[in-house]
Interface confidence: low
């Protein structure tokens, strides 16, 4: 099923998918290594490339396909094909071509952008996968009720790649490559070098051919009260080799097993067309988190993460021209820092400071899906002003050669600010409006055995209102 206007309908349900909100000549960058980018626009030409070109290499602007609005739908995957790019350097009779598959990912995340999953030099084709909520027809539930409590499998969703599983019945013990890649509740994430069909949640990797789809999400988990088990069913449209009248199906059965490990799926039986996996995990056990002082205990893992050793000093981290002072269960900066007397995280600016969350509001949590301890502070100072069209003001900004740290009246009837650091150069501005929000911060601690104390890094900043830090340290490594 295909449309020509960046829209397409699922013929079996009538649901209209519309990717036009992803369009824009500015486009987005897809990386094929840290130094290699592809500039790409969806359903229209990219301003960094030549006329009519939808995608091109960032280094060279070489076209990897002409823009097209022709969107197709098959097996829960939307596809856009850009053909007739520049001649391929290695095969002069071929031209670059790009195939962009859009796969459902319910929540936007850091990987919510196109990713190159494989390059076919024989056909000079680049295969991209973009996991986006716009490719979702309905929200996939990853929870199931067990009486009054809810079992939530979402912490097991693999956010990058997928889980690896092996066929233990195979004789060849020297073969270390996985036989299956698995994700739950949503499709496998794109994996460079493992071209599993876009949209598959269970993917079988044969010894002598390309990976095959043996299961796609069909619905939420199912609880069997008699066996006290949680099941997840997957169906595919791939014909089974052993029986052409059958399609492959997969089933995962989850059992409670307390401990630090989240577990992984293991193949327990197959009849060539149906695959049954078992997954022992604490996720389906009754859950509880307890906080005491600067420590959080996860009842599933039966382990206490203690951050006290990080609370003896404050840490400074700089990004661009902004320096943050960070306290772990302690105030961020000394009394000399105005505005940060009770802040857990403080943005330093001269002898002033802006609190990104009060120490008294501190919360500790453990997040299974990321295997991370999260320390959060809320109710800091008011968020900085934004323009009346909702875009953030950038402070400080240069206007007529002078630097300004707040909204100004100069030259206009109302308070205004620049949307970039240099108004004189960019001339982008808006009238100021105050927000009703308060600054907040979060520190995500993840295990790294090679880092004793480690150091925080700025992970993300949002409108000068929220800041997230990433902190790799052995302090949060489970035993």
């Amino acid at each position: 099923n295909t449309h020509d206007d960046c829209q397409v309908t699922n013929p079996s349900t009538g649901h209209l998918f519309d990717l036009s909100s992803l369009s824009g000549r500015a486009g987005i960058n897809a990386s094929y290594s840290e130094k290699g980018l592809v500039f790409m626009s969806i359903c229209e030409e990219n301003e960094n490339c030549g006329p009519g070109v939808g995608a091109c290499f960032g280094q060279t602007r070489i076209s990897v396909g002409k823009a097209s609005k022709r969107l197709s739908y098959k097996d829960q995957v939307l596809q856009l094909v850009y053909e007739n790019g520049s001649p391929c350097p290695s095969l002069s009779d071929l031209r670059y071509k790009s195939v962009i598959s859009f796969v459902c990912r319910p929540e936007a995340g850091p990987t919510n952008r196109p990713m190159l999953i494989s390059l076919d030099k024989q056909t000079c084709t680049l295969f991209f996968s973009w996991h986006t909520p716009l490719a979702c027809e309905q929200a996939t539930e990853c929870t199931v009720r067990n009486g009054s409590s809810i079992i939530d499998l979402s912490p097991l969703i693999h956010r990058t790649g997928g889980y690896e599983a092996y066929d233990e019945s195979e004789d060849d013990t020297s073969d270390t490559t996985p036989d299956f890649y698995i994700n739950i509740c949503q499709p496998l994430n794109p994996m460079h070098g493992v071209p599993c069909p876009a949209g598959a949640s269970v993917c079988k990797v044969p010894v002598d051919g390309p990976p095959i789809d043996i299961g796609r999400v069909t619905g939420p988990p199912i609880f069997n009260p008699v066996a006290n088990e949680v099941y997840l069913n997957f169906e595919s449209s791939t014909h089974c080799l052993a029986d052409r009248y059958m399609n492959y199906t997969s089933l995962i059965t989850f059992h409670c097993k307390r401990g630090v490990s989240m577990g992984t799926p293991k193949l327990i039986r197959t009849n060539d067309c149906d695959f049954v996996f078992e997954w022992e995990t604490p996720i389906v056990c009754p859950d509880e988190v307890k906080t005491q002082g600067c420590a959080v205990t996860d009842e599933q893992l039966l382990y206490s993460f203690n951050l006290t050793s990080l609370s003896t000093s404050t840490f400074k981290v700089t990004r661009d021209a902004r320096t943050y002072s960070i306290g772990v269960c302690t105030a961020a900066a000394g009394l000399g820092q105005e505005g940060c007397k009770d802040g857990g995280v403080c943005l330093l600016s001269g002898n002033k400071g802006a609190s990104f969350g009060r120490l008294a509001s501190m919360q500790l949590d453990y997040r299974h899906q990321d295997e991370a301890v999260i320390l959060s502070y809320v109710n800091g100072d008011p968020c900085p002003p934004e323009t009346d069209d909702g875009e953030p003001c950038v402070f400080p900004f240069i206007y007529k050669g002078k630097s300004y740290d707040e909204c100004v009246l100069e030259g206009r009837a109302k308070l205004w600010c620049s949307k970039t650091a240099n108004y004189d150069r960019d001339h982008e501005w808006g009238f100021c409006r105050q927000t009703n929000s308060y600054r907040m911060s979060a520190i995500i601690f993840t295990c790294d055995e090679s880092e004793d104390i480690g150091r925080p890094q700025v992970f993300s900043e949002d409108r000068g209102c929220e800041v997230t830090f990433e902190w790799k340290t052995k302090v949060v490594c489970p035993p």
């Epitope: 094929y32 290594s33 840290e34 130094k35 290699g36 290499f57 280094q59 060279t60 602007r61 070489i62 350097p89 390059l119 460079h192 070098g193």
Partner: antibody, heavy 119, light 107 residues
Framework: EVQLVESGGGVVQPGGSLRLSCAAS????????MHWVRQAPGKGLEWVAV????????YYADSVKGRFTISRDNSKNTLYLQMNSLRAEDTAVYYC????????????WGQGTTVTVSS | AIRMTQSPSSLSASVGDRVTITCRAS??????LAWYQQKPDKAPKSLIY???SLEDGVPSRFSGSGSGTDFTLTISSLQAEDFATYYC?????????FGQGTKVEIK
Amino acid sequence: EVQLVESGGGVVQPGGSLRLSCAASGFTFSSYAMHWVRQAPGKGLEWVAVISYDGSNKYYADSVKGRFTISRDNSKNTLYLQMNSLRAEDTAVYYCARDDRFFGGMDVWGQGTTVTVSS
Amino acid sequence: AIRMTQSPSSLSASVGDRVTITCRASQDISSWLAWYQQKPDKAPKSLIYAASSLEDGVPSRFSGSGSGTDFTLTISSLQAEDFATYYCQQYNTYPWTFGQGTKVEIK
């Protein structure tokens, strides 16, 4: 014929400065990222720095950060490496290399120029 | 920085031998690995890019394989002109890093 020719090497005292050049010919220089790689006597290869096709992005090895500056002049098809605060351990053959435009890596190399830092 | 470890550091072989050099990365580098050949007092020459793709003009007796952290360069039948030092190099993450080199000598 695609060619890279380095020049500017020589003997310099510790703490001194030197500027290396790399003249490119036979390809559209302004379409490629460019690298400097060095090799100390009897040792292996060490990547030094890279500059993007338009000069907007630069990355350096930790060992030279703050001392070396990579730059380019696309109108002259020339790549440069400004080396300041030179140390004895900077003694090496310096190669310029072209970045592969599709799959990465360095597909074309110059013949190298020798830098000796000695008092 | 990503560490690249090559083995062996040197080997002796005869013309016609099959030679295998391995390279291990300290973390996942996907397929972003190149192999170079260097002869005494000469500049390095690119042999293989993207772990397994042969540069134009490189004889087919050279082949590369691997992804993730483990990679291999194989010379199926060693020729007299192949005696040289071989380097692997990752370009997944800056700073780019090389292996320490493998010297292939005549037995």
